[in-house]
């Protein structure tokens, strides 16, 4: 006997209804007191609905199953579920047997569409250039698990500093908080874009931030405008300055080298104080140089993977950053 | 009209780089993002990265990390790929393209430069 | 990332014939597709995005269809300038990826 069901899974919204098709051709003469239909979980073939003996004998599955029985003997053998649930998702298996046996399996795929994302700045006022702000990106009651996105304005990926978690509530459903911290520059607008992969559905949100500048303008950062070039196993120095104010201490000043292209810390120099290599232990800044300007940073025994480009943020009241590029010989 | 003006060809040796110019005009240069492209025999057309013309931020296929870094210069309106120890699988020709996003995630090309060939020989 | 794969790779026809040009996803992509037109000596033509929309200035005689892995471009009456090579790409995600070409060539 041919049973004939979707090779594509059914989807289903959460809390909707769906129909998982099933069909078969019945002979000439048949009658519904021939009928034998079980419709069963395929994996652990638990009992959904069943036909038998020419009477429907109703639901087996938390009373949220129907048959279509007006059609039955047209050989349309569908299964109506109710009020669908995360829960629900997986294989189905229609067996039809008159006086031949069929069966076949149908998937039901559930889904829920994330709410529009919100977001939230920390922190969230007295925001300048240079600052690390981290921006958090929430979107609910989801399924399947969610795809996140975070672009800038012009719509280029922003994908390192990027920090995704996601909790399914009791009911299955997905709530997704995503963190992205940004190092801000003059201004800048950063969207998250929630993707549901089942529905394709894009929810997404933006957030523009625009710093206080101070009056005096930006830092003016200088580097090399040629490539450092450093051969393997040697030290190289990363030039970078800025040209400090009368009155100008240490305390007010924010420093920080990173790598252009992946936004991964090198070194920084905050509150004061040297923070520190974040950058395998082999960088180091020229500490008694730093009040005179010289920002520069000192990379030990380079590697062919240190060659690129190293972008060096400075910050005292206002901001400036410049990249010079690492070429290893 | 808007025009992406690439620089000509180039003939390098192996081993060294190349960087190559895309100059554009009637639009406003910072007000969207520019994508570079390979073409080649080997591989059709191949997406190269992005970057915020405004901001210098980048985003490049991971296929081409170390081998392409983009650039660009406001004050003359143009981007900029430089390209890093050339071998022969280099050769090609690459485009500059003007990238139009809606909100998704993902860019099409409104705009594309001429293209400019690079040939690697010794 | 998403594989594009183009067919056929090489196709002629005749002037006010209709021509198809089928792109397929290695993955659902919603509506996510462009076609462009690369001619010799002229810069890369788009012509539609987001799987039917006709970019400005573009005749009405390309159009797009199709959605999630399936996708096709189709000329309606050929005219002699639609002599060219075609390209779809897929817009839905980075890194960007494009089809191997179709060019379609006088018969």
């Known amino acids: 006997l041919e049973v004939q069901v979707p090779e594509d899974p059914v989807v289903a919204l959460v809390g909707t209804d769906a129909t998982l098709c099933c069909s078969f051709s019945p002979e000439p003469g048949f009658s519904l007191a021939q009928l034998n239909l079980i419709w069963q979980l395929t994996d652990t073939k638990q009992l959904v609905h069943s036909f038998a003996e020419g009477q429907d004998q109703g639901s087996a599955y938390a009373n949220r199953t129907a048959l279509f029985p007006d059609l039955l003997a047209q050989g349309n053998a569908s299964l109506r579920l109710q009020r669908v649930r995360v829960a629900d998702e997986g294989s189905f298996t229609c067996f039809v047997s008159i006086r031949d046996f069929g069966s076949a399996a149908v998937s039901l795929q559930v889904a829920a569409p994330y709410s529009k994302p919100s977001m939230t700045l920390e922190p969230n006022k007295d925001l300048r250039p240079g600052d690390t702000v981290t921006i958090t990106c929430s979107s609910y009651q989801g399924y399947p698990e969610a795809e996140v996105f975070w672009q800038d304005g012009q719509g280029v990926p922003l994908t390192g500093n990027v920090t995704t978690s996601q909790m399914a509530n009791e009911q299955g459903l997905f709530d997704v908080h995503s963190i992205l911290r940004v190092v801000l520059g003059a201004n800048g607008t950063y969207s998250c874009l929630v993707r549901n992969p089942v529905l394709q559905q894009d929810a997404h949100s933006s957030v523009t931030i625009t710093p206080q500048r101070s009056p005096t303008g930006a830092v003016e950062v200088q580097v090399p405008e040629d490539p450092v070039v450093a051969l393997v196993g040697t030290d190289a120095t990363l030039r970078c300055s800025f040209s400090p104010e009368p009155g100008f201490s240490l305390a007010q000043l924010n420093l920080i080298w990173q790598l252009t292209d992946t936004k991964q810390l090198v070194h920084s120099f905050t509150e004061g104080r040297d923070q520190g290599s974040a950058y395998a232990n082999r960088t180091a800044l020229f500490p008694d140089l730093l009040a005179q300007g010289n920002a520069s940073l000192r990379l030990q025994r380079v590697r062919v993977a240190d060659e690129g480009s190293f972008t060096c943020f400075v910050s005292i009241r206002d901001f400036g950053s410049a990249a010079v590029s690492l070429q290893v010989a | 009209q808007v025009q992406l003006q690439q620089s000509g060809p180039e003939l390098v040796r192996p081993g060294v780089s190349v960087k190559i110019s895309c100059k554009v005009s009637?639009?406003?240069?910072?007000?969207?993002?520019m994508h570079w492209v390979k073409r080649s025999h080997a591989k059709s057309l191949e997406w190269i990265g992005i970057?915020?013309?405004?901001?210098?931020?980048?985003n490049y296929n991971q296929k081409f990390q170390g081998k392409a870094t983009m650039t660009v210069d406001k004050s003359s309106s143009t981007a900029y790929m430089e390209l890093a120890r050339l071998t022969s699988e280099d050769s090609a020709i690459y485009y500059c393209?003007?990238?139009?996003?809606?909100?998704?995630?993902?860019?099409?090309?409104?705009?594309w430069g001429q293209g400019t060939l690079v040939t690697v020989s010794a | 990332d998403v594989q594009i794969t183009q067919s056929p790779s090489y196709l002629t026809a005749s002037p006010g014939e209709t021509i198809i040009i089928n792109c397929r996803a290695s993955?659902?992509?919603?509506?996510?597709l462009a076609w462009y037109q690369e001619k010799p000596g002229k810069t890369n033509k788009l012509l539609i995005y987001?799987?039917?929309t006709l970019q400005s200035g573009i005749p009405s005689r390309f159009s797009g269809s199709g959605s999630d892995t399936d996708f096709t471009l189709t000329i309606s009456s050929l005219e002699p300038e639609d002599f060219a090579m075609y390209y779809c790409?897929?817009?839905?995600?980075?890194?960007?990826?494009f089809g191997a070409g179709t060019k379609l060539e006088l018969k």
């Open positions: 393209a003007r990238g139009v996003f809606y909100y998704g995630y993902g860019a099409w090309f409104a705009y």
């Open positions: 009637g639009y406003t240069f910072t007000d969207g993002a």
């Open positions: 970057i915020n013309t405004n901001s210098g931020n980048t």
């Open positions: 993955k659902t992509i919603s509506n996510y």
């Open positions: 987001s799987g039917s």
């Open positions: 790409q897929q817009h839905h995600e980075y890194p960007l990826t």
